[in-house]
């Protein structure tokens, strides 16, 4: 039986049940390399409290549909008096990066995971030439996730004192230049994740090979190597390579530019101080507030919730968007869709789509940007579920009693972008981390 998601086959993936201190290792095409789980385990559970290992999914006992992968075992379990077998169930949804398997819940018999990934899309529009896992768990099982830094189009410029060259990088995947008609970036070879431009020539100096690694609690490392044979004439016989070290800052700060810290014979060392390198709980919340010792900030957007059936309205030329954030009030146009953002076609108001649901909410504050994300909306033709990204700006003089109003700024591949100036986005910092 052919592997259902070949792009995900090259790696052993990890997921964590934080509540129970359990680490899962997942290999969807073969078996994980953990002796304690046996030779054919596809999903291996490591209980860190009891220091025990169990296989909860066997690679031989795999069944697959387009959106669901199940691994059974021969181990019996008792579920409400009936004799079942322990199994793992992975639900796949279309995403814009390779993504990460997320632990959802576990019963006595079934371990449930969800995975938003390019591998599950109906069309190839989000697929990279080359992409590697872009997250890692530290020794305390805290997740560090650089997926938000991955550029689907374009690149980051590395700060370098050399005026004659420009070094461009992407994070965990190759640089897509197809949407840029005229810049230097267009000359970069396909597949490169680190592109060096000298004059009118562009060179591949690194492609992703291995996933993100953690070297210390707040330092993550990504390594790119040039796969192609044949040395570059300016590298003195060496093969080019790029090492990017992502550093979680010691306190809250604005984002910084990736900086070249060393360069020798086409070996480039880059340091990037970014809060995305910090553990995810430091940056994100499933509610509309971020506060407490863990986050170093106090943010509360809950006053933006609308009551009594009213919604914020944002004009998107062809569409009207109705938004009701930080609550669970149904938007009238999007009745029974559980939408936080509802898209209505002006020319035909019967065409209504959920552009993100209120129970699929993430508030993120990282590198000085405050963003509220709603995902899991109605599917587009690619299979990607519509989502909305609201970028907040602090404005102490915002209208509407300080609440302000969301402004639609554009759409890319079924992701809808808004900006929102409001006094409730003014962040209060506590200075310790």
């Amino acid at each position: 039986q052919a592997a259902p998601f070949p792009e995900l086959c090259s790696y052993t993936w990890e997921a964590v049940d934080t509540k129970n201190n359990v680490l899962y290792k997942i290999n969807i095409c073969g078996s994980v390399d953990i002796v304690q789980c046996g030779p054919s385990s596809a999903v291996c559970e490591h209980d860190l409290k009891t220091r025990t290992y169990h296989s909860v999914g066997d690679s031989v006992l795999r069944s697959a549909t387009r959106s669901l992968l199940e691994f059974n075992t021969t181990v019996s379990c008792d579920q409400q008096g009936t004799n079942h077998r322990v199994q793992s169930s992975i639900a796949f949804l279309c995403g814009k990066t390779l993504g990460t398997p997320e632990f959802v819940t576990a019963t006595e018999c079934v371990h449930y995971f969800e995975w938003r990934t390019t591998a599950a899309c109906k069309k190839d529009i989000f697929k990279a030439n080359k992409e590697v896992p872009c997250y890692v768990f530290d020794e305390e099982l805290r997740k560090h996730d650089l997926n938000p830094l991955i550029k689907l189009s374009g690149a980051y410029l590395v700060d370098d004192s050399d005026p004659d060259t420009s070094l461009f990088i992407n994070v965990c995947r190759d640089i897509d230049t197809l949407r840029d008609p005229g810049s230097q970036l267009r000359a970069c070879p396909p597949g490169t994740a680190a592109c060096l431009v000298r004059g009118h020539q562009a060179f591949d100096v690194g492609q992703p090979r291995d996933g993100l690694k953690v070297v210390r609690k707040d330092r993550l490392v990504l390594s790119y190597v040039r796969e192609e044979a044949g040395k570059l004439d300016f590298c003195d016989g060496h093969s080019p390579a790029v090492t990017i070290t992502f550093v979680c800052p010691s306190e809250r700060r604005e984002g910084t530019i990736p900086k070249l810290t060393a360069k020798s014979n086409c070996r480039y060392e880059i340091e990037w101080i970014t809060e995305y390198a910090c553990h995810r709980d430091y940056l994100e919340s499933k509610t509309c507030s971020l506060s407490g010792e863990q986050q170093d900030v106090s943010i509360d957007l809950t006053p933006l919730a609308q009551s009594g059936g009213s919604s914020y309205i944002s004009d998107g030329k062809e569409y009207l968007f109705y938004l009701n954030v930080c609550g669970e009030t149904e938007i009238q146009f999007c009745n029974k869709k559980q939408a936080a953002v509802c898209q209505v076609k002006k020319s035909d108001t019967s065409q209504v789509k959920a552009a993100g649901r209120y129970h699929n909410q993430t508030l993120r504050y990282s590198d000085g940007d405050l963003t509220l994300i709603y995902f899991g909306g109605d599917e587009c033709s690619s299979g990607f579920q519509r989502m909305s990204v609201i970028n907040f700006e602090c404005n102490k003089t915002a209208g509407n009693d300080g609440k302000g109003t969301p402004v639609f700024t554009g759409e890319v591949d079924c992701t809808y972008f808004f900006t929102w100036d409001t006094e409730y986005a003014c962040v209060h910092h506590h200075h310790h981390h």
């Epitope: 550029k151 189009s153 374009g154 690149a155 980051y156 410029l157 700060d159 420009s166 461009f168 230049t177 949407r179 840029d180 008609p181 005229g182 810049s183 230097q184 970036l185 267009r186 604005e254 984002g255 530019i257 990736p258 000085g368 940007d369 990204v389 970028n391 700006e393 700024t409 554009g410 759409e411 890319v412 972008f417 900006t419």
Partner: nanobody, 123 residues
Framework: DVQLVESGGGLVQPGGSLRLSCAAS????????WGWFRQAPGKEREFVAA????????SYADSVKGRFTISRDNAKNTIYLQMNSLRPEDTAVYYC????????????????WGQGTLVTVSS
Amino acid sequence: DVQLVESGGGLVQPGGSLRLSCAASGRTFNTYNWGWFRQAPGKEREFVAAIRWSSSKTSYADSVKGRFTISRDNAKNTIYLQMNSLRPEDTAVYYCAASIVDFTTNPSHFGSWGQGTLVTVSS
């Protein structure tokens, strides 16, 4: 691709003000950086200011810091350059540009350009 059209240039006295506008059309969200550049006669094109579309993060050339302000109106897909305390050395053709490269001020990293609008500062 992104199409950019500048307006608002003209003749102004030293110490005066002007506001340039740049209207963007096309798939504007595929570009992350919006910049203003200028080119004086016989000189290289130089960076003036930049802003990211998805947030209000800005950067400025040292020569215009404190005098010029870049801003955007997302509802109108328009980028502005408010120029105060203008000096004769600010005389140039001002260009609006868009880039898919983050953190850059280098004109060669900007792939889409407007036609430019002339600003003359003279008494």
